[in-house]
């Protein structure tokens, strides 16, 4: 077959709009959230999804932008500054910090395109790296050398 | 910024190839790796990146597929079955499990496109959900009701 970059069919068939549509389905983390009696509290549950059973529990915050692809992103927000004790599930242990794990995700923003003489020629996609927080992790504090 | 090649402009402008090119820069998690004397061992370091300071430490494994966008994905692999003690950083605490946090990421596969009468018309992008493991999290084991 012919050399691959031609990603979408032959010239004149613009399916990038289709590509845009595909990507807008929100894809939150896999495990569905179940009700949590204290959804904003600093405690580690013994049931429910991973983010509520973690000893560095977190909640998800929706970040929606209709001019961005994907439109829906989710940011983790830590519910505790320190890690929760494995024994009690509620008391904090100052020997451990609850830290956000970040990721630079590639996103695309929809911007007006300008053709010749500044005429509006549909939309362009502008690629950006967008920082999202994935989860909260219980870590040992850094010991500065 | 310079115009990002009209991805979904007027009919007849096929720049989806350009969109493909943008997206291939590998974008692993933010914090760069630092030396780890026992890179594959079950211990929580007091320095280095988040994944080695975590009490549920993990490493990243590269998953490369030249027919997928993005081509490079990273899977977390837990280095311990249980969480590491905050006190020692090395002994495991059986009261906590080190569990993978999964995410269904939207990816695109390039597939031959077929035009009228089944003729090959370049490549199309097929949207898929692809399961990646983002991190290992220290959780309290589920108590079955």
């Amino acid at each position: 077959y012919s050399h691959w970059p031609s990603c979408c069919p032959s010239k004149g068939q613009d399916t990038s709009e289709e590509l845009l549509r595909w990507s807008t389905v929100p894809v939150p983390p896999l495990e569905p959230a179940r009700p949590n009696r204290h959804p904003e509290s600093c405690r580690a549950s013994e049931d429910g999804p991973l983010n509520s059973r973690a000893i560095s529990p977190w909640r998800y915050e929706l970040d929606r932008d209709l001019n961005r692809l994907p439109q829906d992103l989710y940011h983790a927000r830590c519910l505790c500054p320190h890690c929760v004790s494995l024994q009690t599930g509620s008391h904090m242990d100052p020997r451990g910090n609850s830290e956000l794990l970040y990721h630079n995700q590639t996103v695309f923003y929809r911007r007006p395109c300008h053709g010749e003489k500044g005429t509006h020629k549909g939309y362009c996609l502008e690629r950006r790296l967008y920082r999202v927080s994935l989860a909260c992790v219980c870590v040992r504090p850094r010991v500065m050398g | 910024y310079s115009h990002w090649p009209s991805c979904c402009p007027s009919k007849g402008q096929d720049t989806s190839e350009e969109l493909l090119r943008w997206s291939t820069v590998p974008v692993p998690p933010l914090e760069p790796a630092r030396p780890n004397r026992h890179p594959e061992s079950c211990r929580a370091s007091e320095d280095g990146p988040l994944n080695s300071r975590a009490i549920s430490p993990w490493r990243y494994e590269l998953d490369r597929d030249l027919n997928r966008l993005p081509q490079d994905l990273y899977h977390a692999r837990c280095l311990c079955p249980h969480c590491v003690s905050l006190q020692t950083g090395s002994h495991m605490d059986p009261r906590g499990n080190s569990e993978l946090l999964y995410h269904n990421q939207t990816v695109f596969y390039r597939r031959p496109c077929h035009g009228e009468k089944g003729t090959h018309k370049g490549y199309c992008l097929e949207r898929r959900l692809y399961r990646v493991s983002l991190a290992c999290v220290c959780v309290r084991p589920r108590v079955m009701g």
């Epitope: - | 090119r21 692993p28 490079d72």
Partner: antibody, heavy 121, light 107 residues
Framework: EVQLVESGAEVKKPGASVKVSCKAS????????MNWVRQAPGQRLEWMGL????????SYNQNFKGRVTLTVDTSASTAYLELNSLRSEDTGVYYC???????????????WGQGTLVTVS | DIQMTQSPSSLSASVGDRVTITCSAS??????LNWYQQKPGKVPKLLIY???SLHSGVPSRFSGSGSGTDFTLTISSLQPEDVATYYC?????????FGQGTKLEIK
């Protein structure tokens, strides 16, 4: 100018381990993956694995049966190859090689270290 | 693993000759193939990437072609400095694999 400088020759006994270093300069170390390639005397080049210095992400050649560990020290722009349980057939020159890429087209080893001779006897 | 087989294993040609080296993959690899040149006692150098693209600084007498399973490296007019062993390498899937090499000498 891009340079990869490897550590000096090593002589090891069977069963021992060896650790080879590769110091990079002239480019952003975290921006490119680093490959390791072995060349035994009179043999073809053999890919051992690669590591992304940005996050320590690795891919290994399973033919080495878990004997290879790749690590990096980003603060020193240095990559390391450790090979355990050495045997005589591990004798050869070990190269680090930077991997260049151009989105959706290629991955290629565009700069190579001078090689480190490891002798197992 | 994908097996890469080069032919011939060695060849001798005269200065000015057109030289062709072939590389065959055990399964289709699209255009995901590179060629390296290793001069005696030296480090391998990237010659051609992605089947046919010349690496910077490589003379235009070198060219590459092919797709799928069969690939060719051509030197249009052999020069004395081209004496080396040439290796093909697939990057279609891990583990990356190399051909056994083709040793090129001057008659």
């Amino acid at each position: 100018e891009v340079q990869l400088v490897e550590s000096g020759a090593e002589v090891k006994k069977p069963g021992a381990s060896v650790k080879v270093s590769c110091k990079a300069s002239g480019y952003s170390f975290s921006g490119y993956t680093m490959n390791w390639v072995r060349q035994a005397p009179g043999q073809r080049l053999e890919w051992m694995g690669l590591i992304n210095p940005y996050n320590g992400g690795t891919s290994y050649n399973q033919n080495f049966k878990g004997r290879v560990t790749l690590t990096v020290d980003t603060s020193a722009s240095t990559a390391y190859l450790e090979l355990n349980s050495l045997r005589s057939e591990d004798t050869g020159v070990y190269y680090c090689a930077r991997e260049d890429f151009d989105s959706w087209t290629y991955f290629a080893m565009d700069y190579w270290g001078q090689g480190t001779l490891v002798t197992v006897s | 693993d994908i097996q890469m087989t080069q032919s011939p294993s060695s060849l001798s040609a005269s200065v000015g000759d057109r030289v062709t080296i072939t590389c065959s993959a055990s399964q289709g690899i699209h255009w995901n193939l590179n060629w390296y040149q290793q001069k005696p006692g030296k480090v391998p150098k990237l010659l051609i990437y992605y089947t046919s693209s010349l690496h910077s600084g490589v003379p235009s007498r070198f060219s590459g072609s092919g797709s799928g399973t069969d690939f060719t490296l051509t030197i249009s007019s052999l020069q004395p400095e081209d004496v080396a062993t040439y290796y093909c390498q697939q990057f279609n899937s891990f583990p990356y694999t190399f051909g056994q090499g083709t040793k090129l000498e001057i008659k």
